[in-house]
Structures are given as C-alpha cells and as structure tokens.
C-alpha cells in the first residue's frame, strides 16, 4: 500500500494521531495514538 503525508490543509484533522494519505484508496486516514479512537481520533477509550 502506497502512503504519503496528508495535504497541509489536513494538519488539524486528526485530533490525537497522525494523518496519512492512502494513495491506492484515495483516502485520508488518522493513525490514532494509543488510547484514542474515532475517524479523527477524537474519542478517548482507556
């Protein structure tokens, strides 16, 4: 799977995680920090 960094405009998109762009799927994806979940890593679940 080819990945790259998200565009600059997505800098604040992931609240507690890193935004990566999945080139083959044409999708931005939030890779959440441990303890966080949700599309934008907005939920703390511990």
């Amino acid at each position: 799977v080819s990945i790259t960094k998200c565009n600059s405009d997505m800098n604040g998109y992931c609240l507690h995680g890193q935004c990566i762009y999945l080139v083959d799927m044409s999708q931005n994806y939030c890779r959440c920090e441990v303890g966080y979940t949700g599309v934008r890593c907005e939920h703390f679940y511990l």
């Epitope: 565009n7 600059s8 405009d9 604040g12 998109y13 609240l15 762009y21 080139v23 044409s26 999708q27 931005n28 994806y29 599309v39 934008r40 907005e42």
Partner: antibody, heavy 116, light 106 residues
Framework: QDQLVQSGAEVKKPGASVKVSCKAS????????IQWVRQAPGQGLEWMGR????????KYKEKFEGRVTITADTSTNTAYMELSSLRSEDTAVYYC?????????WGQGTLVTVSS | DIQMTQSPSSLSASVGDRVTITCKAS??????IAWYQQKPGQAPRLLIQ???TLQPGVPSRFSGSGSGTDYTFTISSLQPEDIATYYC????????FGGGTKVEIK
C-alpha cells in the same frame, strides 16, 4: 447514501445578507470539513472558506474576510454560510462541499440573486 | 494564498485530437491537484485527484501528470461529449481553482 442538501434559491436586495444551509445525511459532519465554493454566471469557480465542525474552526479566503461567516450545527448535521453587505457581483450559485477522509463531495448548489 | 495559473483559457480542437491543459502553482503543492469537468447548467464533476488518480467511471482517455508546481491534464482523443470547461484545483493548502479552460470542437 451520503447527501448534502442545500436550501432553496434566494433573491436579495443590495446591502442585505443571505444565509444558505447545507444539511448532511449519511455521514456525520464532525468527521469532515465543509467547504463553500461559488460560481457567478458565466464565471469560474471560487473557493470562499471552510469550517471544521468538530473544532469549530473556520478559514476564509482573504477577499471575503469580515463579510462571510461559516457556521455548523452538529446537533442537526447542518452547515451554514452567511454573506453580508450583498452586491450585484455576489449573484452566483453557492455550493457546499464535503472534504476529509474522502475527496470532495458536492451539494446541488443554491442560486443567490442580488438585485434591486 | 496559493495562485493557480491555468492555460489556455480556451481551445478549439477536432474530434480525435490530443488536448493538453496546464496549471502552474505559485508554490509546490505536493501533487495535491484535482481536475474537474463542468458542462453548462451542471455542477462540476470530479475527474482526477492527487495529480493522476482517475475517479471511478471516468474514461481512460483522461489523464493527469506533474509534480512540484507544474501539472498537466490530457484528453488523449477528444470526443464530442468532452465539450465542457475544465478546472484545476489545488488542495494542498486551503483551496484555489484555476481560471478554467473552455474546450470546443473545431
């Protein structure tokens, strides 16, 4: 299926304000950014600004600063664009556009006519 | 703000011709460029995103390329249904559209 349904056409007098709504269904606007784009008759596409409904943060194109206000009501899954001090050059079709995880998905557009 | 200079503003070509449109960004946009097709009275239709990723259902005669500040959109063999206005959009840092290219049949 995902949808962005915009409010109906408006006719306004110069100097007045207009507020266009954009109701989302099939997805949560908190997972997205909502952008606003306009197109005057026979002219090109122009980005106006956007809101992050989760953080309630907005960014505007410089030329619209102070005249446009983009808001979002996450309880009704609806975004709004209000443009004040209308002039004839603001006659255009206004589109809301979802961005975020997937690439842009457009509403059907709202025609705003400014005429005395 | 990033500026997008699109050229030409209009062109006339014959059916079957290769058509090329360019967009130049005022700074590096890291391949975050999309191309839209718009026909009169219709909303814009997304053809390509991330420089060269064709949207589902878009014919393979449409393609895109480029990097840094210079990007190209190509129709390999112009068809009558391709008559429209085409716009580039940079979405690396906020958003800026190019001025558009009106494509007509000769």
């Amino acid at each position: 299926q995902d949808q962005l349904v915009q409010s109906g056409a408006e006719v306004k007098k110069p100097g007045a304000s207009v507020k266009v709504s954009c109701k989302a269904s099939g997805f949560n606007i908190k997972d997205t950014y909502i952008q606003w784009v306009r197109q005057a008759p026979g002219q090109g596409l122009e980005w106006m600004g956007r809101i992050d409904p989760l953080r309630r943060q907005t960014k505007y194109k410089e030329k619209f600063e102070g005249r446009v206000t983009i808001t979002a009501d996450t309880s009704t899954n609806t975004a709004y664009m209000e443009l004040s001090s209308l002039r004839s050059e603001d006659t255009a079709v206004y589109y809301c556009v979802r961005s975020g995880r997937e690439f842009d998905f457009w509403g059907q557009g709202t025609l705003v006519t400014v005429s005395s | 703000d990033i500026q997008m200079t699109q050229s030409p503003s209009s062109l006339s070509a014959s059916v079957g011709d290769r058509v090329t449109i360019t967009c130049k960004a005022s700074q590096d946009i890291h391949k975050y460029i999309a191309w839209y097709q718009q026909k009169p009275g219709q909303a814009p239709r997304l053809l390509i995103q991330y420089t060269s990723t064709l949207q589902p259902g878009v014919p393979s005669r449409f393609s895109g390329s480029g990097s840094g500040t210079d990007y190209t959109f190509t129709i390999s063999s112009l068809q009558p249904e391709d008559i429209a206005t085409y716009y580039c959009l940079q979405y690396d840092n906020l958003r800026t559209f190019g001025g558009g290219t009106k494509v007509e049949i000769k």
